[in-house]
Interface confidence: medium
């Protein structure tokens, strides 16, 4: 979606309320992939009836992408050549390099619960023996 800002510096945070945060985030956990290949990052929020207003995908403190309930997807300009939205609320990383190794976070901004965060660790391997973690399916 064509947001009218030049880039993102990170950040998140969303609606929340006085209610208990009962939800849980399921993620793909620790995954590995080959250099030059692609990988799907998936999270799933369960055990809450909270409304998801926005999902942010972050790598350390860099914002990769946003999926907003009203506006749809926005990919940060510095990642737009290598990041594709989906499937679902997930994120596809392409043309992987060893520098892509590290922590990735899905942040579900919900009302009235607040922000839920899931963590994925991606290791990008040089060799072809990289074992991909089991594909995570959103029901």
């Amino acid at each position: 979606y064509p947001y009218d800002v030049p880039d993102y510096a990170g950040g998140g945070g969303s609606g929340g309320g006085g209610s208990m945060m009962t939800g849980t985030i399921e993620t793909t956990g620790n995954i590995s992939a080959e250099k030059g290949g692609s990988i799907i990052l998936q999270c799933h929020l369960s055990s809450t009836t909270a409304q998801v207003t926005q999902v942010n995908w972050e790598q350390q403190d860099q914002l990769l992408a946003i999926c907003n309930a009203d506006l749809g997807w926005h990919i940060s300009p510095s990642f737009k050549d290598r990041v594709a939205p989906g499937p679902g609320l997930g994120l596809t990383l392409q043309s992987l390099t060893v520098n892509d190794t590290g922590e990735y976070f899905c942040i579900y901004h919900t009302y009235p619960d607040g922000a839920y965060t899931g963590r994925i660790f991606l290791e990008v391997l040089e060799s072809s023996v990289a074992e991909h973690g089991a594909r995570f399916q959103i029901p």
């Epitope: 009218d4 510096a9 998140g12 945070g13 969303s14 929340g16 403190d61 907003n68 009203d70 506006l71």
Partner: antibody
Amino acid sequence: EVQLVESGGGLVQPGGSLRLSCAASGFTFSNFGMHWVRQAPGKGLEWVAFISSGSSSIYYADTVKGRFTISRDNAKNSLYLQMNSLRAEDTAVYYCARMRLDYYAMDYWGQGTMVTVSS
Amino acid sequence: DIQMTQSPSSLSASVGDRVTITCRASKSISKYLAWYQQKPGKAPKLLIYSGSTLQSGVPSRFSGSGSGTDFTLTISSLQPEDFATYYCQQHNEYPWTFGGGTKVEIK
């Protein structure tokens, strides 16, 4: 240049109504969530209401819930706050503020409009 | 609701001083804290968001740190235009709440 200009404030009796407006320019209004925040004379800031870019998410502070209604007209680049059943404690400067695209902090604010509720 | 407590409520300092303002949340808000500056008769201005990220156009003498419940705004070398009231705001949960403010006055 981002500009937010509030209007519609004034003196009103307890139990009365007012409609505040916020005219936005210098950015794509329809892409941004918007807030109303108020500040009673000599006091701190109090968040009042929020509306998302497409009006699918609307939230209110408990102190105004059921009395105030936030709305927007993206075609007119305008934000509104309909205030009913006004009380003396609603006396404040009311600011409209733009929400950053990536989270719920307010990156641009209007100059404010004063609402005085008094008999 | 999350209560935000700022300290001190006011302080006196001189131009060139290093000034530190703290903000404590009544429960964890991760990194989701913003800092605003407000001058008399004016609207607030966003300085810092997401705990430590400097808003575009804000001088680098302003910095933010902290996560969880304890946060700090630091002005490394106070300038004449920095005398104002500073507010913290949590943006982790509805309803979004502000601290009571810290007034920075000229010594």
